[in-house]
Interface confidence: low
């Protein structure tokens, strides 16, 4: 028997520095977690103690903090090289700055293979990107070889900016021939490493013949056997065992997100490459693990540029950006409109001639808007200003909801109106009329939504059984501010870009902004 240790991360999302327990900015260092310096300590400890170790990343290193905003992926290549990752799969967020924003900072600089079997380049890009990412890689580990085959969510064109010269194929269809190829090369230990979410990970384990282990990402899935060490609630045991269609037991793993845990899986193979046993657990990277001093020093050196960036002007406002709670928790506020407009703008993807865009709607809890921005400071808007407005380090995510769920959400928005509570919704691509004289749960008298399947966008009545795409904060997608119906009834959830980054990019693009209060949210009395 031959034993392999797989160390894995996924959805790190730019958390190069240690973070608080909820993966936001580290405040009290003695209680902070994760970060590449601490990760390196643990990885090196395991590498010294065990013979056959692979360090893998399942995608979405890009996007999530000011590190990515400023360094645009160069930081990912630099620190992943420093940690000596063995392989990485491409995630959807790796395309956030377009193909060029992937090629130059990461693909050309990485000293490890970057993989995806289901992304096919065409046209002029094919020769430009050739060899910079691979469908699979055979890695020597000790005196054996292990095949790693990559995959990426086929939804990436809707979630990021891969352009028109990359085709995202069905994962299972694309993986099978690559695994078959590895088999003909006498590689009998094969890991599928990819970024399509836990449901697809399980399907790959079930359907792709010859895959021995699946290491996934995208869905931020936390798996754990025994008592979990922090706040995350396990979605299942670690590893999650799937019985394949040909009768094998295939371990599937994921390690939550944000570099908070290091996935740790031990696999025992027989001489024919069959998995005999698998066990392990994610390791919580808490303050009991010291940060490696050399990596930490490097982080501090790279940090200097970030501090300078946060005070630079991104753009100007010529109007007061009213992010006050007395506005945003009671009525339409122009800061809410600005943020929602930025959220939609960030999700412009013209992928089909039938649609002007794949999503037109935004909702945003008023309680998530924490500060106004005064235009009398020469109109200047900085990252620092935006960090005061959006201090929680969240993301703006894409969900799919039925109209009936949206209707419930808008009823919840005003079910206890007048108490300055955070659930009052700011909107984009939505016209809502409330009648507060009616009883809670029956106060939405008009709800019109902007069509997407149209060449001239206009507002149509919400249909209860229609499925709609909506951009919203991850806080709401997770049921925050009492929006349990969103969490319980959402049909799909894809994590998006860092909230401040979305707004800062929009302001930089627009240069001068002047959001208005324009009748997106109205109040009426009497019949409709």
């Amino acid at each position: 028997a031959w034993e392999l240790t797989i160390l894995h991360t996924n959805d790190v999302h730019s958390r190069l520095e240690q973070t608080s327990e909820d993966s936001s900015k580290c405040v009290n260092a003695s209680r902070c977690m994760g970060g590449v310096a601490r990760l390196f300590t643990k990885v090196q400890q395991i590498r010294r103690a065990e013979p056959n170790v692979l360090l893998l990343d399942a995608g979405d290193q890009y996007q999530g903090t000011i590190w990515f905003t400023v360094y645009k992926g160069a930081e990912v290549a630099h620190f992943m090289n420093a940690l000596r990752y063995d392989a990485m799969a491409l995630g959807n967020h790796e395309f956030d700055n377009g193909v060029e924003g992937l090629i130059e900072p990461l693909l050309k600089e990485a000293k490890f293979p970057i993989l995806s079997a289901n992304i096919k380049a065409k046209g002029p890009l094919a020769s430009q990107i050739s060899g910079l990412y691979l469908p699979y890689k055979v890695l020597p580990v000790g005196d054996e070889v292990v095949g790693i085959v990559g995959y990426t969510s086929k939804e990436t064109p809707f979630l990021s900016n891969p352009g028109t010269n990359l085709v995202f194929e069905d994962e299972i269809t694309a993986l099978q021939p690559e695994v078959d190829k590895l088999k003909t090369l006498n590689v009998n230990k094969i890991i599928a490493l990819g970024h399509s979410g836990f449901e697809m990970d399980k399907l790959i384990a079930q359907k792709v013949r010859g895959v021995d282990v699946v290491v996934g990402g995208h869905s931020n899935t936390f798996l754990y056997t025994g008592n979990p060490p922090s706040k995350e609630v396990p979605a299942g045991k670690y590893p999650f065992i799937v019985t394949s269609d040909d009768g094998r037991k295939v371990p599937v793993v994921q390690a939550y997100a944000f570099g908070k845990y290091l996935g740790y899986l031990k696999i025992e193979f027989d001489e024919r490459g069959n998995v005999i046993s698998s066990h392990g657990n994610p390791i919580l990277l808490n303050s009991s693990i010291p940060e490696d001093p050399s990596i930490k020093a490097d982080i501090n050196k790279w940090r200097i540029k970030l501090d300078n960036y946060s005070t630079q002007e991104l753009g100007k406002t010529i109007v007061y950006l009213d992010g006050s709670s007395q506005s945003c928790r009671f009525r339409e506020c122009n800061m809410g409109n600005l943020i929602c407009d930025a959220m939609i703008n960030n999700n412009l993807r013209h992928t089909d001639e039938m649609f002007w865009n794949h999503v037109s709607m935004c909702i945003l809890n008023g309680g998530g808007i924490r500060s106004p921005i005064d235009e009398r400071n020469n109109g200047t808007i900085t990252w620092e200003n935006l960090a005061a407005v959006l201090p929680f380090g969240g993301t703006f995510d894409l969900v799919q909801l039925k109209g009936s769920t949206l209707k419930k959400a808008f009823e919840h928005s005003v079910h206890r109106y007048g108490q300055s509570t955070g659930e009052f919704l700011q909107v984009g691509g939505i016209h809502v009329v409330y009648d507060l004289s009616r009883k809670p749960g029956d106060r939405v008298v008009k709800l019109d939504v902007l069509c997407t399947k149209c060449r001239v966008p206009s507002y149509d009545p919400l249909k209860m059984d229609e499925v709609y795409k909506v951009i919203l904060p991850n806080f709401l997608a997770n049921g925050g501010d009492g929006f349990q119906m969103i969490k319980d009834e959402l049909l799909r959830h894809d994590s998006g870009d860092q909230d401040i980054n979305v707004v800062s990019t929009y302001i930089s693009k627009m240069k001068v902004i002047y959001p208005a209060v324009e009748g997106r949210i109205k109040f009426s009395t009497g019949s409709h």
Epitope: E353, G403, S404, C451, P461, K463, M464
Partner: antibody, heavy 121, light 107 residues
């Protein structure tokens, strides 16, 4: 021209399943919903469910929930309706129909020729 | 679920007559209503949608009106090819139910 062509008549025993196909041509298959509607002899039309071929999203009438499965194969521009646990009252002509979804102007503008399914012991 | 009730269920008329068929929904369907014509052994054919918009290629003698829960299909001057069964269907919230049909026969 735009058309939907359905598979041929089927005779099934109670308790069995039937799978009817609907091949689209003359338009972009992934841009329109395909719906399924049935009509028992001498009776009215009954809507069963829909699929949006682009992403495979489906919606079913509560009456058929759990018994009907609508799928698609985009590579051959074909939608399928499978009805399980057949009973004699499922004897009907089954139609597929394209639903326009442009700008909220909703209607079934193109229909298949119909597939007769007979359930008999 | 919204139920659609059509009346009359059958009706005899002569060529040249003006004919009106009504469709009542059990709830407001906000003009999301279509009308179809079906001849024996054939698939239904779209006549009108959004309650009053004539489908492509449909003669102008067919018209639709109504709002809220009550809708009508009118044939201003019956032609021999109009003898068929007519159905309304709403598209407000699923299930997208059809009316029971109105059989229009030659007097």
């Amino acid at each position: 021209q735009v058309q939907l062509v359905q598979s041929g008549a089927e005779v099934k025993k109670p308790g069995a399943s039937v799978k009817v196909s609907c091949k689209a041509s003359g338009y972009t298959f992934t841009s329109y919903d395909i719906n399924w509607v049935r009509q028992a002899t001498g009776q009215g039309l009954e809507w069963m469910g829909w699929i949006y071929p682009r992403d495979g999203f489906t919606g079913y009438a509560q009456k058929f929930q759990g018994r009907v499965t609508i799928t698609r194969n985009t590579s051959i521009s074909t939608a399928y309706m499978e009805l399980s646990s057949l009973r004699s009252e499922d004897t009907a002509v089954y139609y597929c129909a394209r639903k326009e979804g442009y700008r909220g102007d909703w209607y079934f503008d193109v229909w298949g020729q119909g597939t007769t399914v007979t359930v008999s012991s | 679920d919204i139920q659609m009730t059509q009346s009359p269920s059958s009706l005899s008329a002569s060529v040249g007559d003006r004919v009106t068929i009504t469709c009542r929904a059990s709830g407001n369907v906000h003009n999301y209503l279509a009308w179809y014509q079906q001849k024996p052994g054939k698939a239904p054919k779209l006549l009108l949608y959004n309650a009053k918009t004539l489908a492509s290629g449909v003669p102008s003698r067919f018209s639709g009106s109504g709002s809220g829960t009550d809708y009508t299909l009118t044939i201003s001057s019956l032609q021999p090819e109009d003898f068929a069964t007519y159905y309304c269907q709403h598209f407000w919230s699923t299930p997208w139910t059809f009316g029971g049909g109105t059989e229009l026969e030659i007097k």
